[in-house]
């Protein structure tokens, strides 16, 4: 690329006119703070380009960098361009205006920065200083890019004197940004709402100092915008937080709300969403099934636990055969609900050593204002067996029987078994069961009678033993589900004394 | 300019309360966090509470926890330190200040205002 | 809770002297330290934040420095002006000032 004049400096005076031509052998062109101004362009008979840039009545305001450059880069070995700075010295003209952002100027690290005050005539000594300091700074100054330096967080000017008048620039502001990468946290007051009430989402990031919130949510896509509250959370530097508020939520509020979150200085970004539910009225529902009949342990501990889902928060309450239970003073019912989740709730009723007077019909209520749901079970009071009487006895009629009585819940099992041979029996010999209708020599007679008041079974059996030849070795196995119990007894010949 | 003037002060039996006004201007106030910082006797300067531009959220030093309410008004551009159960540790020069938005060091301060609690 | 301990608690210097004082945090503050000066019966000024950033009108004869737990704050040549009390304030985690400096002139 040639450029005529070629500079690399040119001053040129105010309201005159100026010619500059670019030529290449490829399409040239001339540019002017990033546009092409009006120029003649050209292809000469020996196949070079050039470009005619005419300035006219110039003015300080013409002051500055103009480019030749290929028009059309495409193929060829390099992107050449030509630059060349132009003043025009206007009296009228103090620093040249700067667009808004060139006036806040932004830096995560200490590094080398420039202050862009410039004038329209490089022999005008120009000084930098903090906005509200007469100091001059000593700071080196070029006339075409401005003062160039490490600044400390803070606000300058730049002064000049033009004639007999002191002139100042706008002020520029040198930021230093905490800037790290980003990482976006969000969540609700409540993620379930009824229609009516409010919604209220909170984004918050930590340790950047420029971020830009933006919100996605379902009520934005049907034009219906909410205008975002950011907060600057004061518990450690730059925890910022933007609040989303959605007052009187409708159903069409339901679903994906989405915090986007953008650092413009590494241009570093980071989103996070959450689901919101809108339910036209509270509810209450049970989660698991809890069977109709649930059992607990005399003299041991029980804990019956009810699941269920909620919102509102629901009221929960415990009957016991109608009566309300609450915790006991002391300390043999103990009631508690927990929220394990936003909505999912626990309700236990542990019975401490449990009585056989707890046993009965239980009913756990979950309640507002908008639902109720109840779940009703019998708890039966299992007793462990006791064998509470072995007897023999020799009626007239010449047999001999044992009486075996006791009593459980539920209802005991009764085994009868024998040893005829007492020296090896029952550890080497395995003891016979007895009562078996097929044995003719035994016949055995069970009576089960339900207790009402002590709620639990008394079985009573006996065994008629039709003739006993030597010493026998007679036991009485009783068994439920929580237990077992044995009492043995020896039962001798009519003929021999015990 | 930014301008803070505190109002309220003045002396207080222990256990009595009092209220303390900041009236600002020269900002936006609702896009700044305001603070209360006190000085007693002869003492160094000791932060007592914060409070969020929103208003949404507030902080306190822990012995003034339970006993002082921090809070504004961004229609009057005003803070108030409501001062409950009142004890004769309390007695200082209390001033208003202002957070940075983001990094949190106190900005701007009012001139004190003198809280003397004293049967 | 961060505690600060500030020193000296006063310091005599004469005018063009340089004084130093010193702030030490409880735990690390990473750079998070502000400084005040404080005049009876004026509102308290800022003027140094993050460390060593000097507030806009703070004369270049003070500056600061320090990391982790340990700063100080320097006035290069004292100036009758500069008499007065400073403190120190951490606001890594809420806010904690130091127990301050009487600054006096010899």
């Known amino acids: 690329l040639v450029v005529t004049p070629p500079g690399p400096e040119l001053v040129l005076n105010v309201s005159s006119t100026f010619v500059l031509t670019c030529s290449g052998s490829a399409p040239v062109v001339w540019e002017r703070m990033s546009q092409e101004p009006p120029q003649e362009m050209a292809k000469a008979q020996d196949g070079t380009f050039s470009s005619v840039l005419t300035l006219t009545n110039l003015t300080g305001l013409d002051t500055g960098e103009y480019f030749c450059t290929h028009n059309d880069s495409r193929g060829l070995e390099t992107d050449e361009r030509k630059r060349l700075y132009i003043f025009v010295p206007d009296p009228t003209v103090g620093f040249l205006p700067n667009d808004a952002e060139e006036l806040f100027i932004f830096l995560t690290e200490i590094t080398e920065i420039t202050i862009p005050c410039r004038v329209t005539d490089p022999q005008l000594v120009v000084t930098l200083h903090e906005k509200k300091g007469d100091v001059a700074l000593p700071v080196p100054y070029d006339h075409q890019r401005g003062f160039s330096g490490i600044f400390e967080d803070r606000s300058y000017i730049c002064k000049t004197t033009i004639g007999d008048r002191e002139v100042d620039s706008d002020a520029y502001y040198v930021y230093r940004l905490q800037v790290s990468s980003i990482n976006v946290s969000v969540n609700a007051v409540q993620t379930v709402v009824r229609q009516g009430e409010n919604i209220t989402l909170m984004c918050i990031v930590i340790g950047n100092e420029v971020v830009n919130f933006e919100w996605t949510y379902p009520r934005k896509e049907s034009g219906r915008l909410v205008e975002p509250v950011t907060d600057f959370l004061l518990d450690m530097p730059y925890h910022i937080r933007s609040i989303l508020h959605i007052p009187s939520a409708e159903l069409e509020d339901s679903g994906t709300y989405t915090c986007n979150v953008t650092e413009s200085v590494n241009d570093h970004q980071d989103e996070k969403a959450i689901n919101i539910t809108v339910v036209e009225s509270g509810y209450v529902r049970l989660l698991g099934e809890v069977g109709t009949l649930q059992f607990a342990e005399l003299h041991r501990s029980r804990t019956l636990q009810v699941v269920f889902e909620a919102y509102p928060p629901p009221t929960v309450l415990w009957f016991k055969d109608n009566r309300t239970l609450g915790d006991s003073s002391a300390g043999e019912i103990a009631l508690s609900t927990r929220n394990v989740s936003e909505t999912r709730y626990v309700s236990e009723l542990t019975l401490v050593r449990v009585k056989v007077a707890e046993a009965g019909h239980y009913t756990m209520r979950a309640f507002h204002e908008d639902a109720e749901v109840q779940l009703s079970f019998q708890l039966q009071i299992n007793v462990p067996v006791r064998v509470l009487e072995l007897s023999e006895s020799h009626p007239d009629s010449g047999e001999q029987t044992v009486r075996c009585r006791g009593r459980g819940m539920p209802q005991p099992n009764i085994i009868w078994s024998a040893c005829r041979d007492l020296k090896r029996c029952p550890r080497e010999l395995p003891p016979t069961l007895l009562g078996n209708s097929s044995e003719e020599e035994s016949q055995l007679e069970t009576n089960v009678t339900y207790w009402e008041e002590e709620q639990e079974f008394e079985v009573v059996s006996t065994l008629r033993l039709q003739h006993v030849d030597r010493p026998l070795s007679v036991r009485c196995t009783l068994r439920n589900a929580v237990g077992q119990d044995t009492q043995e007894v020896i039962v001798v010949p009519h003929s021999l004394p015990f | 300019e930014v301008q803070l003037v505190e109002s309220g002060g003045g002396l207080v039996q222990p256990g009595r309360s009092l209220k303390l006004s900041c009236a600002a201007s020269g900002f936006t106030f609702s896009n700044y966090g305001m603070a209360w910082v006190r000085q007693a006797p002869t003492q160094g300067l000791e932060w007592v509470a914060s409070i969020t531009n929103s208003g949404g959220n507030t902080y306190y030093r822990d012995s003034v926890k339970g006993r002082f309410t921090i809070s504004r008004d961004s229609a009057k551009n005003t803070q108030y330190l409501q001062m409950d159960s009142l004890r004769s540790e309390d007695t200082a020069t209390y001033f208003c200040?202002?957070?940075?938005?983001?990094?949190?060091?106190?900005?701007?301060w009012g001139q004190g205002l003198m809280v003397t609690v004293s049967s | 809770d961060i505690q600060m301990t500030q020193s000296p608690p006063s310091l005599s210097a004469s005018l063009g002297e340089k004084v130093t004082i010193t702030c030490q945090a409880s735990?690390?503050?990473?750079?998070?330290i502000a400084w005040y000066q404080l005049k009876p019966g004026t509102a308290p000024r800022l003027l140094m934040r993050y460390t060593s950033t000097l507030e806009s009108g703070t004369p270049s004869r003070f500056s600061g420095s320090g990391s982790g737990r340990d700063y100080s704050f320097s006035i290069s040549n004292v100036e009758s002006e500069d008499i007065a009390s400073y403190y120190c304030?951490?606001?890594?985690?809420?806010?904690?000032f130091g127990g301050g400096t009487k600054l006096e002139l010899k």
């Open positions: 304030v951490q606001y890594a985690n809420l806010y904690t």
């Open positions: 200040a202002r957070h940075t938005p983001g990094a949190n060091y106190f900005d701007y």
């Open positions: 735990q690390s503050i990473k750079n998070y």
